[in-house]
Interface confidence: medium
Amino acid sequence: SSSDTCGPCEPASCPPLPPLGCLLGETRDACGCCPMCARGEGEPCGGGGAGRGYCAPGMECVKSRKRRKGKAGAAAGGPGVSGVCVCKSRYPVCGSDGTTYPSGCQLRAASQRAESRGEKAITQVSKGTCEQGPSIVTPPKDIWNVTGAQVYLSCEVIGIPTPVLIWNKVKRGHYGVQRTELLPGDRDNLAIQTRGGPEKHEVTGWVLVSPLSKEDAGEYECHASNSQGQASASAKITVVDALHEIPVKKGEGAEL
Protein backbone atom coordinates (compact mmCIF):
# COMPACT_ATOMS: atom_id res chain seq x y z
CA SER A 1 0.00 0.00 0.00
CA SER A 2 3.04 2.38 -0.11
CA SER A 3 3.46 4.79 -3.00
CA ASP A 4 6.32 2.87 -4.62
CA THR A 5 4.17 -0.24 -4.96
CA CYS A 6 1.12 1.49 -6.39
CA GLY A 7 -0.01 -0.01 -9.65
CA PRO A 8 -2.68 1.36 -11.94
CA CYS A 9 -5.86 2.27 -10.10
CA GLU A 10 -8.62 -0.28 -10.64
CA PRO A 11 -11.72 0.92 -8.76
CA ALA A 12 -13.49 -2.36 -9.54
CA SER A 13 -11.02 -4.20 -7.32
CA CYS A 14 -11.42 -1.83 -4.36
CA PRO A 15 -13.02 -3.31 -1.25
CA PRO A 16 -16.60 -2.03 -0.85
CA LEU A 17 -17.42 0.68 1.66
CA PRO A 18 -19.92 -0.18 4.41
CA PRO A 19 -23.46 0.03 3.00
CA LEU A 20 -24.48 2.52 5.69
CA GLY A 21 -21.58 4.75 4.74
CA CYS A 22 -18.68 6.13 6.74
CA LEU A 23 -19.53 8.05 9.88
CA LEU A 24 -16.58 10.40 9.59
CA GLY A 25 -16.49 10.69 5.82
CA GLU A 26 -14.33 9.02 3.21
CA THR A 27 -10.66 9.27 2.42
CA ARG A 28 -8.42 7.46 -0.09
CA ASP A 29 -5.90 4.70 0.46
CA ALA A 30 -2.13 5.36 0.37
CA CYS A 31 -2.17 5.06 -3.41
CA GLY A 32 -4.96 7.61 -3.71
CA CYS A 33 -7.11 5.02 -5.45
CA CYS A 34 -9.61 3.19 -3.28
CA PRO A 35 -12.11 5.02 -1.11
CA MET A 36 -12.03 4.05 2.55
CA CYS A 37 -13.60 5.23 5.76
CA ALA A 38 -11.80 8.06 7.53
CA ARG A 39 -10.59 7.02 10.94
CA GLY A 40 -11.81 8.51 14.18
CA GLU A 41 -10.19 9.29 17.51
CA GLY A 42 -8.17 6.35 18.84
CA GLU A 43 -8.45 4.43 15.58
CA PRO A 44 -5.34 3.06 13.82
CA CYS A 45 -3.79 5.04 10.99
CA GLY A 46 -0.65 5.91 9.11
CA GLY A 47 0.32 2.75 7.23
CA GLY A 48 2.37 2.85 4.06
CA GLY A 49 5.28 4.87 2.75
CA ALA A 50 3.17 7.67 1.36
CA GLY A 51 1.44 7.78 4.71
CA ARG A 52 -1.69 9.27 3.18
CA GLY A 53 -3.89 10.62 5.96
CA TYR A 54 -6.53 8.15 6.95
CA CYS A 55 -7.77 10.30 9.81
CA ALA A 56 -10.98 12.30 9.64
CA PRO A 57 -10.89 16.10 9.30
CA GLY A 58 -9.75 17.76 12.53
CA MET A 59 -7.63 14.73 13.44
CA GLU A 60 -4.01 13.83 12.93
CA CYS A 61 -2.16 10.55 12.90
CA VAL A 62 0.23 10.36 15.83
CA LYS A 63 2.89 7.66 15.78
CA SER A 64 2.62 5.36 18.74
CA ARG A 65 5.67 3.36 19.77
CA LYS A 66 3.61 1.14 21.99
CA ARG A 67 0.45 -0.22 20.41
CA ARG A 68 -2.45 0.16 22.78
CA LYS A 69 -4.11 -3.14 23.48
CA GLY A 70 -7.59 -3.24 22.00
CA LYS A 71 -7.07 0.02 20.19
CA ALA A 72 -4.46 -0.76 17.59
CA GLY A 73 -3.71 -4.44 17.88
CA ALA A 74 -1.27 -6.24 15.60
CA ALA A 75 -3.87 -6.93 12.95
CA ALA A 76 -5.70 -3.68 13.42
CA GLY A 77 -4.92 -1.87 10.24
CA GLY A 78 -2.81 -4.19 8.16
CA PRO A 79 0.92 -3.82 7.53
CA GLY A 80 2.68 -0.62 8.43
CA VAL A 81 0.11 0.64 10.89
CA SER A 82 2.12 2.89 13.16
CA GLY A 83 -0.15 5.34 14.88
CA VAL A 84 -3.57 6.38 16.08
CA CYS A 85 -5.78 9.31 15.13
CA VAL A 86 -5.95 12.04 17.75
CA CYS A 87 -7.81 15.31 17.81
CA LYS A 88 -5.75 18.25 16.55
CA SER A 89 -7.49 20.65 18.91
CA ARG A 90 -6.98 19.19 22.35
CA TYR A 91 -8.68 21.99 24.26
CA PRO A 92 -12.12 21.78 25.90
CA VAL A 93 -15.16 23.11 24.05
CA CYS A 94 -18.69 23.92 25.16
CA GLY A 95 -21.54 22.12 23.43
CA SER A 96 -25.03 23.43 22.76
CA ASP A 97 -26.27 20.83 25.28
CA GLY A 98 -24.43 22.69 28.06
CA THR A 99 -21.80 19.96 28.39
CA THR A 100 -18.07 20.64 28.32
CA TYR A 101 -16.23 18.23 25.98
CA PRO A 102 -12.46 17.57 26.25
CA SER A 103 -12.09 18.22 22.51
CA GLY A 104 -14.05 19.21 19.42
CA CYS A 105 -13.70 15.65 18.17
CA GLN A 106 -15.48 14.30 21.24
CA LEU A 107 -18.22 16.87 20.78
CA ARG A 108 -18.70 15.70 17.18
CA ALA A 109 -18.86 12.09 18.38
CA ALA A 110 -21.46 13.03 21.01
CA SER A 111 -23.45 14.88 18.36
CA GLN A 112 -23.52 11.82 16.12
CA ARG A 113 -24.61 9.65 19.05
CA ALA A 114 -27.41 12.10 19.80
CA GLU A 115 -28.56 12.11 16.17
CA SER A 116 -28.50 8.32 16.05
CA ARG A 117 -30.95 8.37 18.98
CA GLY A 118 -33.17 10.76 17.08
CA GLU A 119 -32.11 13.73 19.22
CA LYS A 120 -30.91 17.16 18.12
CA ALA A 121 -27.34 17.53 16.88
CA ILE A 122 -24.89 19.13 19.33
CA THR A 123 -22.98 22.14 18.06
CA GLN A 124 -19.98 23.96 19.48
CA VAL A 125 -21.07 27.10 21.30
CA SER A 126 -17.63 28.28 22.38
CA LYS A 127 -14.05 27.28 23.02
CA GLY A 128 -13.27 26.47 26.64
CA THR A 129 -15.52 25.10 29.33
CA CYS A 130 -19.25 25.86 29.44
CA GLU A 131 -20.28 28.63 31.77
CA GLN A 132 -22.56 27.66 34.63
CA GLY A 133 -24.16 29.52 37.47
CA PRO A 134 -22.87 28.98 41.00
CA SER A 135 -24.09 26.13 43.12
CA ILE A 136 -23.43 25.34 46.76
CA VAL A 137 -21.31 22.21 47.15
CA THR A 138 -21.13 22.26 50.97
CA PRO A 139 -23.41 24.70 52.82
CA PRO A 140 -22.55 26.13 56.26
CA LYS A 141 -23.86 24.24 59.29
CA ASP A 142 -25.76 25.63 62.29
CA ILE A 143 -23.56 26.21 65.34
CA TRP A 144 -24.35 26.39 69.06
CA ASN A 145 -21.68 27.60 71.48
CA VAL A 146 -20.95 29.61 74.58
CA THR A 147 -19.71 33.20 74.78
CA GLY A 148 -15.96 33.49 74.48
CA ALA A 149 -15.66 30.43 72.26
CA GLN A 150 -13.97 30.38 68.84
CA VAL A 151 -16.32 29.22 66.08
CA TYR A 152 -16.30 29.17 62.29
CA LEU A 153 -18.74 28.68 59.42
CA SER A 154 -17.55 27.28 56.11
CA CYS A 155 -19.08 27.25 52.65
CA GLU A 156 -17.92 25.59 49.41
CA VAL A 157 -19.25 26.76 46.05
CA ILE A 158 -18.64 25.97 42.39
CA GLY A 159 -19.37 27.73 39.10
CA ILE A 160 -17.87 28.68 35.74
CA PRO A 161 -16.42 31.29 35.72
CA THR A 162 -15.22 30.71 39.29
CA PRO A 163 -17.71 32.52 41.57
CA VAL A 164 -17.03 35.37 43.96
CA LEU A 165 -17.99 34.43 47.52
CA ILE A 166 -19.18 36.93 50.13
CA TRP A 167 -20.70 36.59 53.62
CA ASN A 168 -23.68 38.54 54.90
CA LYS A 169 -25.34 38.68 58.28
CA VAL A 170 -29.09 38.51 57.78
CA LYS A 171 -31.09 40.91 59.94
CA ARG A 172 -34.82 40.39 60.14
CA GLY A 173 -36.78 43.51 60.92
CA HIS A 174 -40.48 44.03 61.65
CA TYR A 175 -43.10 42.47 59.38
CA GLY A 176 -40.62 39.90 58.02
CA VAL A 177 -38.53 42.51 56.19
CA GLN A 178 -34.93 41.37 55.98
CA ARG A 179 -31.75 43.25 55.24
CA THR A 180 -28.19 42.01 55.03
CA GLU A 181 -24.98 43.37 56.44
CA LEU A 182 -21.83 42.63 54.41
CA LEU A 183 -19.20 40.97 56.58
CA PRO A 184 -16.74 41.50 58.19
CA GLY A 185 -17.94 45.10 58.53
CA ASP A 186 -16.22 46.89 61.39
CA ARG A 187 -16.24 43.95 63.79
CA ASP A 188 -12.81 43.13 65.15
CA ASN A 189 -13.77 39.67 66.48
CA LEU A 190 -14.70 38.46 63.01
CA ALA A 191 -12.45 37.42 60.10
CA ILE A 192 -13.30 36.27 56.58
CA GLN A 193 -11.02 33.95 54.64
CA THR A 194 -11.49 32.68 51.07
CA ARG A 195 -9.40 30.35 48.93
CA GLY A 196 -9.74 28.60 45.59
CA GLY A 197 -10.55 24.89 45.54
CA PRO A 198 -10.55 22.14 46.52
CA GLU A 199 -11.61 21.44 42.89
CA LYS A 200 -11.20 23.57 39.76
CA HIS A 201 -13.75 26.43 39.61
CA GLU A 202 -14.52 25.93 43.31
CA VAL A 203 -14.15 28.47 46.09
CA THR A 204 -14.25 27.79 49.82
CA GLY A 205 -14.90 30.57 52.33
CA TRP A 206 -14.86 30.76 56.12
CA VAL A 207 -16.20 33.17 58.72
CA LEU A 208 -14.13 32.94 61.93
CA VAL A 209 -15.66 34.45 65.09
CA SER A 210 -13.40 34.77 68.13
CA PRO A 211 -14.30 35.44 70.83
CA LEU A 212 -18.01 34.72 70.35
CA SER A 213 -20.36 37.27 71.90
CA LYS A 214 -24.15 37.51 72.25
CA GLU A 215 -24.21 40.08 69.44
CA ASP A 216 -22.79 37.48 67.02
CA ALA A 217 -25.91 35.32 67.29
CA GLY A 218 -28.02 35.22 64.17
CA GLU A 219 -28.21 34.02 60.60
CA TYR A 220 -25.14 34.09 58.34
CA GLU A 221 -25.47 33.81 54.59
CA CYS A 222 -22.83 32.55 52.18
CA HIS A 223 -23.53 34.18 48.80
CA ALA A 224 -21.84 33.18 45.54
CA SER A 225 -22.18 34.98 42.22
CA ASN A 226 -20.73 34.94 38.71
CA SER A 227 -21.80 36.11 35.25
CA GLN A 228 -24.27 33.24 35.03
CA GLY A 229 -26.19 33.74 38.26
CA GLN A 230 -26.06 33.48 42.00
CA ALA A 231 -26.65 31.02 44.84
CA SER A 232 -26.75 31.28 48.58
CA ALA A 233 -27.02 29.16 51.72
CA SER A 234 -27.28 30.16 55.33
CA ALA A 235 -26.68 28.86 58.84
CA LYS A 236 -27.45 30.11 62.33
CA ILE A 237 -25.07 30.81 65.18
CA THR A 238 -26.80 30.41 68.54
CA VAL A 239 -25.01 31.73 71.62
CA VAL A 240 -25.82 30.07 74.97
CA ASP A 241 -24.73 30.80 78.53
CA ALA A 242 -23.56 27.30 79.41
CA LEU A 243 -22.49 24.19 77.49
CA HIS A 244 -25.31 22.10 78.98
CA GLU A 245 -27.80 24.33 77.14
CA ILE A 246 -26.56 23.06 73.78
CA PRO A 247 -29.08 20.56 72.38
CA VAL A 248 -27.52 17.23 71.41
CA LYS A 249 -29.23 15.05 68.82
CA LYS A 250 -29.21 11.36 69.64
CA GLY A 251 -26.03 9.73 68.33
CA GLU A 252 -24.16 12.95 67.53
CA GLY A 253 -22.34 15.68 69.36
CA ALA A 254 -22.99 19.38 68.99
CA GLU A 255 -20.97 21.39 66.47
CA LEU A 256 -18.67 23.39 68.73
Epitope: P18, P19, C22, G70, G77, S116
Partner: nanobody, 128 residues
Protein backbone atom coordinates in the same frame (compact mmCIF):
# COMPACT_ATOMS: atom_id res chain seq x y z
CA UNK B 1 -12.18 -19.94 18.00
CA UNK B 2 -14.60 -17.15 18.90
CA UNK B 3 -17.84 -17.73 20.77
CA UNK B 4 -20.71 -15.28 21.11
CA UNK B 5 -23.33 -16.25 23.68
CA UNK B 6 -26.65 -14.41 23.91
CA UNK B 7 -28.81 -14.42 27.04
CA UNK B 8 -31.71 -12.49 28.53
CA UNK B 9 -34.48 -13.61 26.19
CA UNK B 10 -37.80 -14.97 27.40
CA UNK B 11 -41.53 -14.50 27.48
CA UNK B 12 -42.75 -10.97 28.12
CA UNK B 13 -46.08 -9.16 27.99
CA UNK B 14 -46.82 -6.44 25.42
CA UNK B 15 -45.33 -3.17 26.63
CA UNK B 16 -42.71 -4.98 28.68
CA UNK B 17 -38.92 -4.72 28.54
CA UNK B 18 -35.96 -7.06 28.18
CA UNK B 19 -32.21 -6.64 28.33
CA UNK B 20 -30.31 -9.00 26.07
CA UNK B 21 -26.62 -9.67 26.65
CA UNK B 22 -24.02 -11.09 24.31
CA UNK B 23 -20.79 -12.29 25.90
CA UNK B 24 -17.79 -12.82 23.64
CA UNK B 25 -14.94 -15.21 24.38
CA UNK B 26 -12.10 -16.92 22.58
CA UNK B 27 -8.34 -17.12 22.62
CA UNK B 28 -6.61 -14.07 21.09
CA UNK B 29 -10.02 -12.44 20.46
CA UNK B 30 -9.76 -8.71 21.15
CA UNK B 31 -13.40 -7.74 21.67
CA UNK B 32 -12.65 -4.02 21.52
CA UNK B 33 -11.43 -4.38 17.93
CA UNK B 34 -14.85 -5.55 16.76
CA UNK B 35 -17.95 -3.70 15.67
CA UNK B 36 -21.04 -5.42 17.02
CA UNK B 37 -24.58 -5.73 15.73
CA UNK B 38 -27.92 -7.24 16.72
CA UNK B 39 -30.22 -9.03 14.28
CA UNK B 40 -33.46 -10.95 14.67
CA UNK B 41 -35.06 -13.78 12.77
CA UNK B 42 -38.83 -14.27 12.91
CA UNK B 43 -40.47 -17.40 11.43
CA UNK B 44 -41.02 -17.08 7.68
CA UNK B 45 -38.99 -13.85 7.46
CA UNK B 46 -35.47 -12.86 6.48
CA UNK B 47 -32.92 -12.22 9.19
CA UNK B 48 -33.40 -8.52 10.02
CA UNK B 49 -30.69 -6.06 11.05
CA UNK B 50 -31.69 -3.97 14.10
CA UNK B 51 -28.82 -2.00 15.55
CA UNK B 52 -25.03 -1.65 15.54
CA UNK B 53 -22.28 -0.17 17.67
CA UNK B 54 -18.73 0.74 16.67
CA UNK B 55 -15.67 -0.88 18.23
CA UNK B 56 -15.18 2.02 20.64
CA UNK B 57 -18.85 2.32 21.61
CA UNK B 58 -18.82 5.95 20.50
CA UNK B 59 -21.35 5.51 17.71
CA UNK B 60 -24.64 3.66 17.55
CA UNK B 61 -27.15 3.03 14.78
CA UNK B 62 -30.80 1.95 14.97
CA UNK B 63 -33.19 0.91 12.23
CA UNK B 64 -36.69 2.37 12.25
CA UNK B 65 -38.17 -0.87 13.61
CA UNK B 66 -36.45 -0.38 17.00
CA UNK B 67 -35.48 3.31 17.03
CA UNK B 68 -36.67 5.14 20.12
CA UNK B 69 -37.39 1.97 22.09
CA UNK B 70 -34.05 0.20 22.17
CA UNK B 71 -30.51 0.94 23.28
CA UNK B 72 -27.34 -0.84 22.24
CA UNK B 73 -24.30 -0.50 24.49
CA UNK B 74 -21.06 -2.33 25.12
CA UNK B 75 -18.63 -2.93 27.96
CA UNK B 76 -15.22 -3.64 26.46
CA UNK B 77 -13.84 -4.57 29.88
CA UNK B 78 -16.44 -7.35 30.17
CA UNK B 79 -16.36 -8.37 26.48
CA UNK B 80 -20.12 -7.90 26.37
CA UNK B 81 -22.61 -6.07 24.19
CA UNK B 82 -26.15 -5.32 25.39
CA UNK B 83 -29.49 -4.62 23.77
CA UNK B 84 -32.17 -3.00 25.92
CA UNK B 85 -35.61 -3.51 24.38
CA UNK B 86 -38.52 -1.45 25.69
CA UNK B 87 -42.23 -1.20 24.87
CA UNK B 88 -42.18 -4.65 23.26
CA UNK B 89 -44.88 -5.63 20.75
CA UNK B 90 -46.03 -9.05 19.54
CA UNK B 91 -44.28 -8.38 16.20
CA UNK B 92 -40.96 -8.27 18.11
CA UNK B 93 -41.26 -12.02 18.68
CA UNK B 94 -38.16 -13.60 17.12
CA UNK B 95 -34.81 -15.20 17.80
CA UNK B 96 -32.31 -12.42 18.52
CA UNK B 97 -28.70 -12.81 17.42
CA UNK B 98 -25.58 -10.78 18.11
CA UNK B 99 -22.78 -10.63 15.56
CA UNK B 100 -19.20 -9.35 15.45
CA UNK B 101 -17.14 -7.83 12.66
CA UNK B 102 -13.45 -6.94 12.88
CA UNK B 103 -13.32 -3.18 12.37
CA UNK B 104 -11.54 -0.31 14.04
CA UNK B 105 -13.14 2.20 11.72
CA UNK B 106 -16.06 4.47 12.55
CA UNK B 107 -18.60 2.77 10.32
CA UNK B 108 -21.72 0.66 10.75
CA UNK B 109 -22.28 -2.73 9.21
CA UNK B 110 -25.81 -3.80 8.42
CA UNK B 111 -25.72 -6.87 6.23
CA UNK B 112 -25.51 -10.49 7.36
CA UNK B 113 -22.56 -11.20 5.06
CA UNK B 114 -20.40 -8.48 6.62
CA UNK B 115 -20.33 -10.07 10.06
CA UNK B 116 -17.74 -12.75 10.79
CA UNK B 117 -18.98 -14.25 14.04
CA UNK B 118 -22.51 -15.07 15.20
CA UNK B 119 -24.12 -16.24 18.41
CA UNK B 120 -26.61 -19.08 18.71
CA UNK B 121 -29.50 -16.71 19.39
CA UNK B 122 -31.92 -16.15 22.24
CA UNK B 123 -35.71 -16.47 21.88
CA UNK B 124 -37.87 -13.43 22.65
CA UNK B 125 -41.62 -14.03 22.77
CA UNK B 126 -44.02 -11.13 23.27
CA UNK B 127 -47.54 -12.16 24.24
CA UNK B 128 -50.58 -9.96 23.86
Amino acid sequence: SVQLQESGGGLVQTGGSLRLSCAASGRSFTFSSYAMGWFRHAPGKEREFLTAITWSGDYTYYTDSVKGRSTISRDNAKNTVYLQLNNLKPEDTAVYYCAAKFSQVSAFFATVSEYEYWGQGTQVTVSS
